[in-house]
Each structure stands twice: as C-alpha cells, then as structure tokens.
C-alpha cells in the first residue's frame, strides 16, 4: 500500500498522527470496529502531551480509548506495552467493578470528565477517538 502523508478530511493532525473525534456514542467493540474500517485504531495514549491533546478535543465527556482487559491483562489495541507505557487512571481505578448490575465486571477504558481514565462496562455507548499514524502504509491500493 501507499504511505499516508496527510490526514483524511475531518481528521486532526498532531505529532505525526491523525485523530478523528466522534460526536455520537457506540459500545467499545463497535467503536473499535469503526476505527478499523477507517484503517485506524482506537486512540492509544503514549504521553502526557498526547493525553492533553485528546482531552482538549473531547471536553469533559466519557470517551472510549484503545485499552481493554477483556482477555485478562490490560492491552493497547496497537500492541503498545501497557506495563511500561503511559498511564493516567483516576484514583482507585481500574477497579473491575461488578456492582453495576449489567453482568460481569469492567473491561474497557475511557476518558472521564477530568481526562483521567476509568474502566467501565464495554457495552456502554460512549463517544470514541480513532487514531492512525502518518507515514504508515495504508491498506488502499495505490492509484495507477
């Protein structure tokens, strides 16, 4: 595929990545799928500056990111190492709370109203952020 050198229309460029901010809500898996269909992934936060950039754009609204522990340990959707990477959980989080009455615990991470992270039920219809890296080979065939 060809290298992407600029962001698609309606995406925002920042530090060699492109971001798309939803204005509607979806369950985490549907948001994840939406980003994949756009040749992107749910946002992976690798620094405090990236955290603040995303916060600036989403405002104080619960918003999914590309972090989950549905298969045990916490994992970023692009393979970024969770243990050694940037983390910004709210105090006392993640807590895998079972008291919500929806069945199971809490396996998907989202930005909260103050920007810090919380784990929540993956079926909740939150907004989401897609990210794709510039200079990454896109899946589209080159124009002949």
């Amino acid at each position: 595929g060809s290298e992407r050198t600029c962001c698609p229309v309606n995406w925002v460029e920042h530090e060699r990545s492109c971001y798309w901010f939803s204005r509607s809500g979806k369950a985490w898996a549907d948001a994840d799928n939406y980003c994949r269909l756009e040749d992107a992934h749910l946002v992976v936060v690798t620094s405090w500056e990236e955290q603040k950039f995303v916060q600036h754009h989403i405002g104080p609204v619960n918003t999914w990111m590309g972090l989950h522990d549905q298969n045990g340990p916490w994992k970023w959707v692009d393979g970024t190492d969770y243990e050694t990477g940037f983390k910004n959980w709210r105090p006392e989080q993640p807590d895998d709370w079972y008291g919500h009455g929806l069945g199971g615990g809490e396996d998907c991470a989202h930005f909260t109203d103050d920007g810090r992270w919380n784990d929540d039920v993956c079926q909740r219809p939150y907004r989401w952020v897609c990210e794709t890296e510039l200079d990454k080979a896109s899946q589209e065939p080159p124009l002949l």
Epitope: E49, K52, Q55, H56, P91, D114, G115
Partner: antibody
C-alpha cells in the same frame, strides 16, 4: 477549606542539602497531583516539579533535573522537595500548590517558605 | 521547552480603566493557558484557567480569551485591589512555564 503549609526553609550553605515539606489539609490529598514553584527575590515565578496523586509520575524543570527530588507521603498528607548541592541561585521562596486534574493549573497555593543559600 | 512571553512588562492605569495583557506561547498549547495574580509578599492565586474559565470567587471583571498561541487577559474596569503582578502559564507540556509577568500599578 484547602490549606497548604510549607516548612523547612532557612539559611543554608552552598553545597548542602535541604528538604522542604508541604502539609496539606481540607481536601483528599491522595487524589491530587502537587506542584512546587519557586520565586527568586524580585523575580518571576519558576515552575519546578509535579508529582501525580499516587507518586507514579514525576516531571521536573530541566534546570533542576537530577538535583531536586519531589516525593509525597499520602499517609501523612505531606509533599516534599529534596534539594541537593544547593547553589546561590536556588535562593527563593518555594511554594507548593495543588494541581487541578483536568487542566494542571495550580488552583491552591501555600504561603511559601524562604530558602537562602549563603556562606 | 515552551517559551511564554507577556506584554507589556508593566503598565500604569487609572481606577476604572480597561486593561489588556497579552501572552504568547512559542508553540500551540491548545486550551492549557492559566492566569495568576500576585500581590507583594503574597502567594499567587489563580484567576483564570483553561483560557477563559473564571476560578470560583474571582470577580467577573476579569476575562480571558485566545487560542493556540495567543492569549489575552482583560480587566474590564480596574479596581484598587487589582494593582498587582499578573502571570500567564502554560500547562500543556512539562516544564509548565510561566510568562515573565506584567506589573499593573496606579497612574
């Protein structure tokens, strides 16, 4: 009400070390990041360091990296600043301040403690 | 590091005057711009955070505006208690640098 009280300042010789403390009350200390900011006599404000609510992340001004250490004891509601190899240019009023978690601004400040480095 | 500049460095004004202080960042800091007021011998206090949000208890004559790299603090009608030094600060990227300050005194 939120209260921050710094202590530990005084006159100290160049090359010595000092540990400043900041006692916090009136809020859940363990839920907030904390800053140190200093102000040399007659000069402006200089941001020094921040520590996250649980101590997991610490960031410093380039000018003091390796010489200053920020730490906290949440069981004592106390913030610390360890200053090593003191220099004349470290003479300043040192303020602790609470971090607003959304914006990182300093929303509450202590009254400051004066450190004078002199032989 | 992000550099913050302020202008003017000092100004003299009458009670009742409209006063404007500008702050410029060396790169985009989005909405992470805060304004502080400091009186002699006292600790600073936050007036405005996130460009235009007024801190609780701060009079409405203070307002903030701007975006990206250029920001403004406005005092709509200067009061005797407003004579002080004003600092802007970016809290986007560490180190969280302050501007050099603007001293507002009585004409």
């Amino acid at each position: 009400q939120v209260q921050l009280v710094e202590s530990g300042g005084g006159v100290v010789q160049p090359g010595r070390s000092l540990r400043l403390s900041c006692a916090a009350s009136g809020f859940t200390f363990s839920s907030y990041g904390m800053h140190w900011v200093r102000q040399a006599p007659g000069q402006g404000l200089e941001w020094m360091a921040i520590i996250w609510y649980d101590g997991s992340n610490k960031y410093y001004a380039d000018s003091v990296k390796g010489r200053f250490t920020i730490s906290r004891d949440n069981s004592k509601n106390t913030l610390y600043l360890q200053i090593n190899s003191l220099r004349a240019e470290d003479t300043a009023v040192y303020y602790c301040a609470r971090e607003d978690p959304r914006t990182s601004c300093s929303d509450y400040w202590g009254q400051g403690t004066l450190v004078t480095v002199s032989s | 590091d992000i550099q913050m500049t302020q202008s003017p460095s000092s100004l003299s004004a009458y009670v009742g005057d409209r006063v404007t202080i500008t702050c410029r960042a060396s790169q985009n800091i989005f909405s992470y711009l805060n304004w502080y007021q400091q009186k002699p011998g006292k600790a600073p206090k936050v007036l405005i955070y996130a460009v235009f949000s007024l801190q609780s208890g701060v009079p409405s004559r203070f307002s903030g505006s701007g975006s990206g790299t250029d920001f403004t603090l406005t005092i709509s009608s200067l009061q005797p208690e407003d004579f002080a030094t004003y600092y802007c600060q970016q809290s986007y990227s560490t180190p969280f640098t302050f501007g050099p300050g603007t001293k507002v005194d009585i004409k």
